[in-house]
């Protein structure tokens, strides 16, 4: 229904407190470079001005668009042009292009300093000191750096960080608290930024069809017991708030979201029979809770999906009058019967049914012609299956760390023109597929392991987007969205690559090193790992376990040393001496 | 490998007319074959499409007065109750091998005038 | 029922030059089922691209699909004098019954 004054109107449905936080990530997301203060300054003038409108809804401006007034308020920052260069240029054109010139401008790389949580005793200073402030900083800070973060789920993160805060400020060894539960949120944060970028990416590329597939096999894995109309509805629903998300309309997106889930809750009977625990909690836990339901028990009696999709004499025919409901009803039944199966997966599946018919639905004897499309999966399906089985085993054998080295190295060969930096970042983020995936139960690991996977792949593709150096990287990631994993595994050594120079440079270390904590350790050896690939790219697998070896001791012994700095400046030299002689 | 239509003149409106298009070199028992029709310095009409197997699909404003049909080696497009909007040059054409629904047609006849007028 | 949009028309341009037509679909076609005509007067359409931007056998590379969804261009570039007919865009919906032809745009050569 249209309201007088859309702000009014999402202001009351929001309340005052998520509706401060909303408006705080679309500017943090939109302006990434902008000090906390200067953004708290203009949250506080949107929310008075949206008081104004609750209180007279025919209030001068209350009738413009949200857009509109976010848009006015970026445009009047005083310096816009000195801070953010050509975005300024948004500020000449008209709504709807003005958005689309603020989101043309987002920068999934942004150049700030890694967000360093502070020590146990001052964040629980500052905490209880201004618990409002503190948590703005915090959804300031992460917005700024993930400007596709799902915002109304980034506000439940918020109120975790506020849970977790509480709770072990009054402890007594407040880190000995706060660093595991922190770490804890931290981790499922960033899962949750790479997922929701993928998201938007999917968005964007491919449009709302797509996305729209993508949720109707992911709900009917969730809730095989609901109907396909029931499926379709959730799926269109979910479509509609991630393009909201997507398209910077934070306040539209976290109250359909509350929507949804307040339909969920009022629709359990032909929804699911695992709602229930979620429904009872308030509205961020409720939604959240619902995002991450587990699947329902697989209805016993299901009949074999040949039957409507292979056996019926009315295949091509149902296929050809309504392609988007055949296909649609495909992807449903066949998801429902895989909870074991990836979503990238069962659209693979999906999309070489759907050739299979498009083939051989104008032939002559079309079920002859399609009559196998089904056996036709084992491929696509053991393809995914002996990934994990292989990937998981090297894991089990080398650990997080050594298994993200294995991975290193692999996409460094695949594509050694990437930047170092991108490499490791995305090998670590591969690597930790691992921990997050090995561990689970046969059942669950292959859709943890790819869809995990797929997601990382996209943050590599929108970094590679910004800067494009690799033709083979470009080719994965300009195809589907659902075949850019498997693209990935299918890359080889690129032997169109001119090895890198040795430069001694980057291979001198210091005694900082030593102080660093265990992660930057890490990231530096890691570093010089990619390094040395791009160096020697055809290096094998032994001549590489003994220079990192070798680094390892070298580094160990030096920080070991009295004279930490004279050990770097005189062991430093022999050891590149050393790994050249190795890996000539 | 070619189509040609034929059976186009001129009629009356109301009156039924039936043109063929006959194939030479191609097994229509193999491949799809639409007909597209085009109105005197206009753009292009698809009216609807026959698959191998004799299964036919319209355009939804063609439904009910046009029916495609394929007696033997040549593809019929039978018309009711024409009126003067009808009046068209009529095309048929082959829909690309290892395509059911899609809009590619890569051979086509040199097409047949219809013009209906009193 | 599916409409396809085309601009401009018509359109000249110089011999060498470049010529870009759009082609509009409401609502997204599907799963790029998009494909470019050329068709001189007196004679049956040509299909130059099909799948949005794959180009057919013997159609020079002078011509380039690209696009995805609701909105599609055919670029020309180093325009030829035989370039000069009407370009008509078609898309295919998830009915079959929706297939539609663009209003076709003429590209006239100066």
């Known amino acids: 229904e249209a309201h007088k004054s859309e702000i009014a109107h999402r202001f009351k449905d929001l309340g005052e407190q998520h509706f401060k936080g909303l408006v705080l990530i679309a500017f943090s997301q939109y302006l990434q470079k902008c000090p906390y203060e200067e953004h708290i300054k203009l949250v506080q003038e949107v929310t008075d001005f949206a008081k104004t409108c609750v209180a007279d809804e025919n209030a001068e401006n209350c009738d413009k668009s949200i857009h509109t007034l976010f848009g006015d308020k970026l445009c009047a920052i005083p310096k816009l042009r000195d801070n953010y260069g050509e975005l300024a240029d948004c500020c000449a054109k008209q709504e709807p292009e003005r958005n689309e010139c603020f989101l043309q401008h987002k920068d999934d790389n942004p150049n700030l300093p890694p967000f360093q949580r502070p020590e146990a005793e001052a964040m629980c200073t500052s905490f209880q000191e201004n618990p409002t402030s503190f948590l703005g900083h915090y959804l300031h800070e992460v917005a700024r750096r993930h400007p596709y973060f799902y915002a109304p789920e980034l506000l439940y993160y918020a109120e975790k960080y506020n849970e977790v805060l509480t709770q072990c400020c009054t402890e007594s060894d407040k880190a000995a608290c706060l660093t595991p539960k922190l770490d804890a949120v931290k981790e499922k944060a960033l899962v949750a930024a790479v997922r929701q970028r993928m998201k938007c990416s999917s968005m964007q590329r491919f449009g709302e069809r797509a996305f729209k597939a993508w949720a109707v096999a992911r709900m009917s894995q969730r809730f095989p017991n609901a109907e396909f109309a029931e499926i379709t509805k959730l799926a269109t629903d979910v479509t509609k708030i991630n393009k909201e998300c997507c398209h910077g309309d934070l306040l539209e997106c976290a109250d359909d979201r509350a929507e949804l889930a307040k339909y969920m809750c009022e629709n359990q009977a032909t929804i699911s029979s695992k709602l229930q625990a979620c429904c009872d909690k308030p509205v961020l836990q409720k939604s959240q809770c619902l995002a991450e339901i587990e699947h329902d028990n697989i209805p016993a009696d299901l009949p074999s999906i040949a039957a409507d999709f292979v056996e019926d004499k009315e295949v091509c025919k149902n296929y050809a009058e309504a392609k988007d409901v055949f296909l649609g009803t495909f992807l449903y039944e066949y998801s429902r019967r895989h909870p074991d199966y990836s979503v990238s997966l069962l659209l693979r599946l999906a999309k070489k049914y759907e050739a299979t018919l498009e083939k051989c639905c104008a032939e002559g004897d079309p079920p002859a012609c399609y009559g196998t499309v089904l056996a036709e999966f084992q491929p696509l399906v053991e393809e995914p299956k002996n990934l994990v089985k292989t990937n998981c085993e090297l894991y089990e054998k080398l650990g997080e760390y050594g298994f993200q080295n294995a991975v290193l190295v692999r996409y460094t060969q695949k594509a050694p023109q990437v930047s170092t930096p991108t490499l490791v970042e995305a090998a670590r983020n591969l690597g930790r597929v691992g921990t997050k995936c090995c561990t689970l139960p046969e059942a669950q690991r292959l859709p943890c392991v790819e869809d995990y996977l797929s997601a990382i792949l996209n943050r590599l593709c929108v970094l590679h987007e910004k800067t494009p150096v690799s033709e083979k990287v470009t080719k994965c990631c300009s195809g589907s969205l659902v075949e850019r994993r498997p693209c990935f595994s299918a890359l080889t050594v690129d032997e169109t690559y001119v090895p890198k120079e040795f430069k001694a440079e980057t291979f001198t270390f210091h005694s900082d090193i030593c102080t660093l904590p265990d992660k930057e350790k890490q990231i530096k050896k890691q570093t010089a790992l990619a390094e040395l690939v791009k160096h020697k790219p055809k290096a094998t697998e032994d001549q590489l376990k003994t220079v990192m070896g070798d680094f390892a001791q070298f580094v160990d012994k030096c920080c070991k040393a009295a004279d930490k700095d004279n050990c770097f400046a005189t062991e430093g030299p022999n050891l590149v001496a050393r790994s050249k002689e190795a890996l000539a | 490998q070619s189509l040609e239509e034929s059976g186009g003149r001129l009629v009356t409106p109301g009156t039924p007319l039936t043109l063929t298009c006959t194939v030479s070199?191609?097994?229509?028992?193999?491949?799809?074959i639409n007909w597209v029709r085009q109105a005197p310095g206009k753009g292009l009409e698809w009216i609807g499409i026959i698959w191998a197997s004799g299964t036919t699909f319209y355009a939804t404003w063609a439904k009910g007065r046009f029916t495609i049909s394929r007696p033997s080696t040549t593809v019929d497009l039978e018309m009711t109750s024409l009126t003067t909007a009808d009046t068209a040059t009529y095309f048929c054409a082959r829909t690309v091998p290892g395509y059911s629904t899609a809009p590619y047609f890569d051979l086509w006849g040199p097409g047949t005038l219809v013009t209906v007028s009193s | 029922a599916a409409v396809l949009t085309q601009t401009p028309s018509p359109v000249s341009a110089a011999v060498g030059g470049t010529v870009t037509i759009n082609c509009q679909s409401s609502p997204s076609v599907w799963s790029n089922f998009l494909s470019w005509y050329q068709q001189k007067p007196g004679q049956p359409p040509k299909l130059l691209i099909y799948?949005?931007?794959k180009l057919t056998s013997g159609v020079p590379s002078r011509f380039k699909g690209s696009g995805s969804g609701t909105q599609f261009t055919l670029t020309i570039s180093d325009v030829q004098c035989g370039d000069a007919a009407t370009y008509y865009c078609?898309?295919?919906?998830?009915?079959?019954?929706?297939?539609?032809f663009g209003g076709g745009t003429k590209v006239v050569v100066k």
């Open positions: 078609g898309g295919g919906y998830s009915s079959i019954s929706d297939t539609t």
């Open positions: 070199g191609i097994d229509l028992s193999n491949y799809a």
């Open positions: 799948e949005a931007s």
